[in-house]
Interface confidence: low
């Protein structure tokens, strides 16, 4: 089986306040089995943004059709962006377990928030 890679192609994304931000993430293998999660920030203080196994996450929608069995696109859209949403977002693959354990992280995408156009 191909070794899993997590590709976050955008190093940074800039979005105007009030708009939606699309954060891209694709994976290259279905294995190991386990959910994808998105976090803002790293380390103990990181904030969970999206978890494939939990929810709902009212401001977050998946960009692709995640019901496709071989889906490898876990890009997300975050609506109604505010300055508080600024930060680096990591797409992380977890390995199934009790509990699920972190397997591999993408390189991160930095989200900056511009002032709302007047």
């Amino acid at each position: 089986e191909e070794e899993l890679q997590i590709i976050q192609p955008d190093k940074s994304v800039s979005v105007a306040a009030g708009e939606s931000a699309i954060l891209h993430c694709t994976i290259t293998s279905l294995f190991p089995v386990g959910p994808i999660q998105w976090f803002r920030g790293a380390g103990p203080a990181r904030v969970l943004i999206y978890n494939q196994r939990q929810g709902p996450f009212p401001r977050v929608t998946t960009v692709s059709e995640t019901t496709k069995r071989e889906n490898m696109d876990f890009s997300i859209s975050i609506s109604n962006i505010t300055p508080a949403d600024a930060g680096t977002y990591y797409c992380i693959k977890f390995r199934k377990g009790s509990p699920d354990t972190e397997f591999k992280s993408g390189a991160g995408t930095e989200l900056s928030v511009r002032a709302k156009p007047s």
Partner: antibody, heavy 121, light 110 residues
């Protein structure tokens, strides 16, 4: 409320064809993969075929590959199963099922009431 | 194929556990997620009780719970009710075979 209503079940002879339909409502049809699951009399559940929501990628159980064709009409929110070269062992209640949004680890969160297909000479 | 007992029984108000094993494994030691379905009578529409091993839909009573260890998953019903008498199917997704189900376990409430 999510509703899945199957139709098209009938009594047919071996070798004949049949087309099942499933009318869906209560959810955005294009956002979800759909499948057919069958249950032979007194038996368990058997997944038959599935189709993804937007790009029509299809999947089949080995037992029906080459004989059955799954398709969907997103404009009509309708799922189809074209069954050719029917055999006695295809006799079953056929359920139309909606896939959940749990990526490729698929679970079926809504089921229709089923339609009975009987293949007998 | 998934393996589960053909039948189990439980006292009204008691606890019953139904096991299911045989989901696929991969070279890295990971395994498939399981779900559980309830069918009240033959030919009636099954209802999903548990998905992702242990997640319960919001409309399913909390007496139903799921847990998984290795390639064995367990459905636990705590405080069994008369209306829980039904056939319970475990299910999973195999990347080569598509969705697969166990043969079903009939629960009798005494």
């Amino acid at each position: 409320d999510v509703q899945l209503v199957e139709s098209g079940g009938a009594v047919v002879r071996p070798g004949e064809s049949l087309r099942l339909s499933c009318k869906a409502s209560g959810f955005t049809f294009t956002n979800f993969a759909m499948s057919w699951v069958r249950q032979a009399p007194g038996e368990g559940l058997e997944w038959v075929s599935g189709i993804s929501g937007s790009d029509d990628t299809t999947y089949y159980a080995d037992s029906v590959k080459g004989r059955f064709t799954i398709s969907r009409d997103n404009s009509e929110s309708t799922l189809y199963l074209q069954m050719n070269s029917l055999r006695a062992e295809d006799t079953a209640v056929y359920y139309c099922v909606k896939d959940s949004t749990v990526s490729w680890n698929t679970f079926f969160d809504y089921w229709g009431l089923g339609t009975l297909v009987t293949v007998s000479s | 194929a998934l393996t589960q007992p053909a039948s189990v029984s439980a006292n009204l108000g008691g606890t019953v556990k139904i096991t299911c094993s045989g989901g696929y494994g991969s070279d890295d030691g990971s395994s498939s997620y399981y779900g559980w379905y309830q069918q009240k009578s033959p030919g009636s529409a099954p209802v999903i009780l548990i998905y992702w091993d242990d997640k319960r839909p919001s409309d399913i009573p909390s007496r139903f719970s799921g847990s998984t260890s290795g390639s064995t998953t367990t459905l636990t019903i705590t405080g069994v009710q008369a209306e829980d008498e039904a056939v319970y199917f475990c299910g999973t997704y195999d990347t080569s075979s598509g969705a697969i189900f166990g043969a079903g376990t009939t629960l009798t409430v005494l």
